[in-house]
Amino acid sequence: QAGPLPKPTLWAEPGSVISWGNSVTIWCQGTLEAREYRLDKEESPAPWDRQNPLEPKNKARFSIPSMTEDYAGRYRCYYRSPVGWSQPSDPLELVMTGAYSKPTLSALPSPLVTSGKSVTLLCQSRSPMDTFLLIKERAAHPLLHLRSEHGAQQHQAEFPMSPVTSVHGGTYRCFSSHGFSHYLLSHPSDPLELIVSGSLEDPRPSPTRSVSTAAGPEDQPLMPTGSVPHSGLRRHWE
C-alpha cells in the first residue's frame, strides 16, 4: 500500500508580510499527479478557495488583488490526486501591515550610545495595543515581540538593551498590534538609527526584562489617564 501523499509547499509572493491594498499571490506546489488544489484559511469555512493546477499540474495560484484585513491569517493547502487528498502543507501566515497608524520609536536616553552602557527603545502607539514588535533591518525575524500577559492594552512598550555592543547598532522599526489578530499590524514606525560608539566588545548581548507601562497623566502626552492597570508585557524572543 502506498504511503500518504507528500505534503505540498505553500508560499506567498512577493512575501508573507503585505501592506494594505497591495497584491499578493499564494502558490501551492504539489506533484505532477495533482488534479485540484485547495486552500484553507484558519477560522474560515473550508475550503477557502479551489483552483485547477497550472501546467505542468504541479502547482496552483491563488491571487489576492488587493490586501485587506479579511485576507490576513493562517493558510494551509492540499492537492487531490487520483489516489486522494494530500497531507496539509505547513502553514503560511499572511500578515497585513497598515491596519493601524504608525507608532513612534525612540531611544532613551539617546540613539547615540557608548558600548557597555544601556539603552532602551521605546515604542509608543496612538491607540492602546497589546502587542509590540521591534524589528532590526536585515534581521530575518522580529527581534523582540512583546505581548500583554492579560490582554491589557497599553500605549507603549520598552525594549531595554544592556550592555550595548556593536551588535546592537543599526536601523530599527517597531509595529503595534491587537491580540485579537496578530496577523494585523500597524504601519511601521519611522526608522531609528542606533549608533554604538566605543570598543567594548561582547558578541552576545543580553537584553534585560521588558517593561510596559500604562499611560501616565503628566508625562504621557495625550495618553488617557488611568486607562489600564500595570500588567507588563511578556517578552518573546523569535
Epitope: T68, G98, Y100, S101, T104, L122, S127, G216
Partner: antibody, heavy 117, light 113 residues
C-alpha cells in the same frame, strides 16, 4: 491612494442642524482616528474632536461639547459630524482629517457651511 | 489649553531667500518619556486643505521638499524654508499635540517680496 471625500456645501438657518460626511478610502478605515477641524472665513484652524471608527470612541473640544456629534458607518467607511443649534459664528469650512499620531497626515477637501437667516 | 503663538503674522521674502516662521507654546511640548516635541507644521494654500510638512518638530513628512526644515524644543520652534520658491506662497500653521484640546497657531502668511 488615501482619500477623504467630504459632502457638499450647506446653507442653514440659525438654530438648525447640519450633518457633514467624510468618506474614507485607500487605507484600513477602522484603524485610524478621524478628527474634525473648523476654519472660519479668513481665520485659523480650530480642533473640534475625533472619532475612532473601530469602536466609535469620541472625544470633543469642550467648546463644541453638546453641539457636535460624531458618528461612523463602518459599512461605507464614512464618518459624520453633526452640528446642532447653529449660529452665525458656525459659518466656516469644516475639514475631516486622518490622525497619524495626534497630528494629521491626510485632510478632506473641506465642506463650507453657511449659517444665515 | 495650550496657546500657540506664531510670529510674524505675515512675511514677505524674495525668491531664493530664506524664510523663517516662529511658533511659541504656552507650555513645554517636550515629553520626558520619549524626548520628543509634540509639534507639527502645516502649509495651507488658498482654497485647499492644510498639508502636513513636519511632525515631531523636525521630522519631514514623506514627499516634502528638503528646503523645509523644522527645529526647536520645549516652547520655541521654527519652520525654515531655505530657498523660497513661488509655490511656497501659503499660510503656515503650527499645531501642538501634547495635550487635548489640540491647538493651532493663528497662522503666518508667507508672500513673495
Amino acid at each position: 491612494e488615501v482619500q477623504l471625500v467630504q459632502s457638499g456645501a450647506e446653507v442653514k438657518k440659525p438654530g438648525a442642524s447640519v450633518k457633514v460626511s467624510c468618506k474614507a478610502s485607500g487605507y484600513s478605515f477602522t484603524g485610524f482616528y478621524i478628527d474634525w477641524v473648523k476654519q472660519p472665513p479668513g481665520k485659523g484652524l480650530e480642533w473640534i474632536g475625533y472619532i475612532f471608527p473601530s469602536n466609535g470612541e469620541t472625544s470633543y473640544n469642550q467648546k463644541f461639547k453638546g453641539r457636535a456629534t460624531m458618528t461612523v458607518d463602518k459599512s461605507t467607511s464614512t464618518v459624520y459630524m453633526e452640528l446642532s443649534s447653529l449660529r452665525s459664528e458656525d459659518t466656516a469650512v469644516y475639514y475631516c482629517a486622518r490622525q497619524a499620531f495626534y497630528y494629521f497626515d491626510y485632510w478632506g477637501q473641506g465642506t463650507t457651511v453657511t449659517v444665515s437667516s | 489649553d495650550i496657546v500657540m503663538t506664531q510670529s510674524p503674522d505675515s512675511l514677505a521674502v524674495s525668491l531664493g531667500e530664506r524664510a523663517t516662521i516662529n511658533c511659541k507654546s504656552s507650555q513645554s511640548l517636550l515629553s520626558s518619556s520619549n524626548q520628543k516635541n509634540y509639534l507639527a507644521w502645516y502649509q495651507q494654500k488658498p482654497g485647499q486643505p492644510p498639508k502636513l510638512l513636519i511632525y515631531w518638530a523636525s521630522t519631514r513628512e514623506s514627499g516634502v521638499p528638503d528646503r523645509f526644515a523644522g527645529s526647536g524644543s520645549g516652547t520655541d520652534f521654527t519652520l525654515t524654508i531655505s530657498s523660497l520658491q513661488a509655490e511656497d506662497v501659503a499660510v503656515y500653521y503650527c499645531q501642538q499635540y501634547y495635550s487635548y484640546p489640540l491647538t493651532f497657531g493663528q497662522g503666518t502668511k508667507l508672500e513673495i517680496k
